[in-house]
């Protein structure tokens, strides 16, 4: 006779990430047995939602129920339909909702209602869709990472489950880098954090954590380029903008009204005798750098050490994950290696600005235009972010390990969000039974 | 102090157009979303059209779809109110008003008013 | 559009009474209606927003409840000064004005 298979007494977990340029669907799965062990949750789906951040849709919120339709459908095939019922969905929106909300929080209400609505006529249980804040952002990204790396075991191992572990209990800053926002979020060596709202207390497995974490709005790679292409503008003498951040031969016509529609760039409006401006890439990697720099006010620092725009930054500490756009953007680079110093990161980026955008979209040509143009962009936008902004150097250089996966599952706030509101992480260690670490084995 | 100056009213015809501007002085003009209401002679208040601070967002009344355009310039602080087709039904006083702010959001309920503009469409 | 509905059209009070004001809305609004008071001649003037939240320089006289589909203004006490026209609003939808509701004093 056949065997047949026992049932896998497993759960699911369902996250939309509603970022500022498009929704991700993660979903998570775990042993129900082991809930409150360290890394035994894994994500076995991620699904792109067609179209952009939910954002968008504040002038068609009508459009929202079939954007996600595609998605939600994904997760009830991988979900077997005995588990429907019981799988907790959440939806996290963030920086392009906060940047809505700024705009009218009734706004902002609106998309959120009717996101609930449309995710509310699902199998699932539906948990609620909310705008996360920039320090629960930051917090679960390095909830998320420490929890892979299995910062959070007590156990010492004697064999490393993933390549970045170093094999001792010192957590891994998190950097995370969106459209609309940056995050950065580490345990500061015996600092203390100056400012209160910069400042997160966790009880984990029984261990105590003082986390620092910001978040800041605005300087995502997206919003970053809006902010510079406000602040270079103003200075062009005529509707032709010479931009050192594109390839050489690049153009571009951008509309006024486009540039000025987000509350990032109201710093730089103004009135200008034209509708509309092109860029023209010139790819130089040094002027792009001194444009960027410019968009960081370090002048002023009511602290012992700041960031930039006055926000106080503790000295880093220990190895960092830099995840997300960190990661996409230099994995198209070909710059994630840990092999690879900072100087030399900076000389293929010198290298790869200057090249003709001709050359360019030869090389590339399975890659839209519209993301490939703006590599040269957002690769020396992270250089300037991680050097001048958060003060790393060409020696810290080595302590960032540019993450895209860690045991399969994305690297990203969502996996410490579903931790947090399914309380899988506890305050306490759980009691150790002798099975507790065989997914170890 | 905040204030709101409304101009452009006037008589004129059924189907003719008429601009409408609102003068803001007081606060930072592009921080804060702008809107036209109008009132009917005798008659309650009726909202008109909305501009948000960073024009994600722009909308009419049904009765005035259309035939009506809000613009804003914000180097000038101002707003404006492009009728065109107008009809005897579009006789009112109209109020340049601000969007209030919830602490850190905005809102979109009225925080400041202007003293208002005449526009009577009559033949 | 959300249609919004007040009572009583007008009503007379008597100096330091109460006088209350209720407005419905013909689906929920959240906690978004404000308020507003209009004297003869004058633009309106923003009392209460968010539904209970008292607009900057206006008496602690005024006050404002509800959410959903039901709200009200409450004046305790009433002073000859508070005679003029009120107005609900709701901004959960393109925004809509009540009819209006004639306050005087007696």
């Known amino acids: 006779t056949q065997n047949k298979a026992l049932p896998e007494n497993v759960k699911y977990g369902i996250v939309l990430d509603a970022g500022s340029s498009h929704t991700s669907l993660y979903i998570y799965k775990w042993p129900a047995e082991k809930e409150n062990d360290t890394g035994v949750v894994h994500q076995v789906e991620e699904c792109r939602v067609k179209g952009p951040g939910i954002s968008k849709f504040v002038q068609k919120v009508n459009e929202i129920g079939i954007y996600l339709t595609d998605c939600m459908e994904r997760a009830r095939e991988v979900i077997p339909r005995s588990q429907h019922q019981e799988t907790p969905v959440y939806l996290g929106a963030t920086a392009g909702m906060r940047l809505l909300r700024m705009e009218s929080e009734e706004l902002a209400d609106r998309v959120l209602d009717v996101v609930e609505r449309s995710l509310s006529n699902y199998p699932f249980d539906f948990q609620g869709a909310r705008i996360i804040t920039g320090q629960e952002e930051g917090a679960y990204g390095w909830i998320t990472i420490n929890y892979l790396l299995g910062k959070f075991s007590q156990k010492t191992r004697w064999f490393s489950i993933v390549p970045y572990e170093t094999n001792n209990q010192e957590t891994f800053g998190a950097l995370d880098l969106g459209g609309a926002s940056t995050q950065v979020t580490f345990v500061p060596q015996n600092q203390t954090i100056e400012s209160p709202d910069n400042a997160l207390q966790f009880r984990l497995y029984g261990k105590d954590y003082n986390v620092y974490t910001h978040s800041f709005l605005c300087y995502g790679k997206d919003q970053a380029l809006w902010q510079k292409l406000a602040k270079d503008i103003q200075v062009a003498s005529n509707e032709i903008l010479r931009d050192p951040c594109f390839h050489p031969g690049y153009k571009k016509v951008v509309n006024v009204s486009d540039l000025y529609k987000t509350p990032c760039t109201k710093r730089f409006e103004m009135t200008l005798p034209f509708q509309q401006f092109e860029i023209q890439g010139i790819g130089n990697y040094q002027q792009c750098h001194q444009s960027i720099l410019e968009l960081f006010n370090t002048s002023y620092c009511p602290y012992s050490q700041c960031a930039f725009n006055g926000i106080f930054l503790p000295p880093l500490q220990g190895d960092f994950g830099a995840f997300s756009a960190f990661y996409f953007v230099m994995k198209f680079l070909n710059l994630t290696s840990e092999k690879v110093s900072q100087e030399k990161v900076t000389e293929m980026m010198k290298k790869f600005c200057a090249q003709p955008w001709e050359e360019i979209k030869t090389s590339y040509a399975g890659v839209k235009e519209k993301y490939l143009s703006e590599y040269c962009f957002s690769g020396t936008y992270i250089l300037s972010l991680l050097l001048q902004g958060y003060h790393f150097t060409a020696d810290s250089w080595e302590h960032i390990h540019f993450i895209g996966k860690i045991q399969g599952s994305d690297a990203g706030w969502t996996l410490g969000y579903m931790l947090n509101l399914t309380n899988m992480i506890p305050a306490e260690q759980p009691l150790s039974t002798p099975l507790s670490h065989s997914t170890y084995v | 102090e905040v204030q709101l100056v409304e101009s452009g009213g006037g008589l004129v015809q059924p189907g003719r157009s008429l601009r409408l501007s609102c003068a803001a002085s007081g606060f930072t003009f592009n921080n804060y979303g702008m809107n036209w209401v109008r009132q009917a002679p005798g008659k309650g208040l009726e909202w008109v059209s909305s501009?948000?601070?960073?024009?994600?967002?722009?909308s009419y009344a049904d009765t005035v779809k259309g035939r009506f355009t809000i613009s804003r310039d914000n180097a000038k602080n101002s707003l404006y109110l492009q009728m065109n087709s107008l009809r005897a039904e579009d006789t009112a006083l109209y109020y340049c008003?601000?969007?209030?702010?919830?602490?850190?959001?905005?809102?979109?309920?009225?925080?400041?008013w202007g003293q208002g503009t005449m526009v009577t469409v009559s033949s | 559009d959300t249609v919004l509905t007040q009572s009583p059209a007008s009503l007379a009070v008597s100096p330091g009474q109460r006088a209350t004001i209720t407005c419905r809305a013909s689906?929920?609004?959240?906690?978004?209606m404000h308020w507003y008071q209009q004297k003869p001649g004058q633009p309106p003037k923003l009392l209460i927003y968010?539904?209970?939240n008292l607009a900057s320089g206006v008496p602690a006289r005024f006050s404002g409840s509800g959410s959903g589909t039901d709200f009200t203004l409450t004046i305790n006490p009433v002073e000859a000064d508070d005679t003029a026209n009120y107005y609900c609003?709701?901004?959960?939808?393109?925004?809509?004005f009540g009819q209006g509701t004639k306050l005087e004093i007696k």
């Open positions: 689906e929920g609004v959240k906690s978004y």
């Open positions: 968010k539904a209970s």
């Open positions: 609003q709701q901004s959960w939808n393109d925004p809509t």
């Open positions: 008003a601000r969007h209030g702010r919830y602490g850190g959001y905005g809102g979109f309920y009225f925080d400041y």
């Open positions: 501009f948000s601070s960073s024009s994600t967002y722009i």
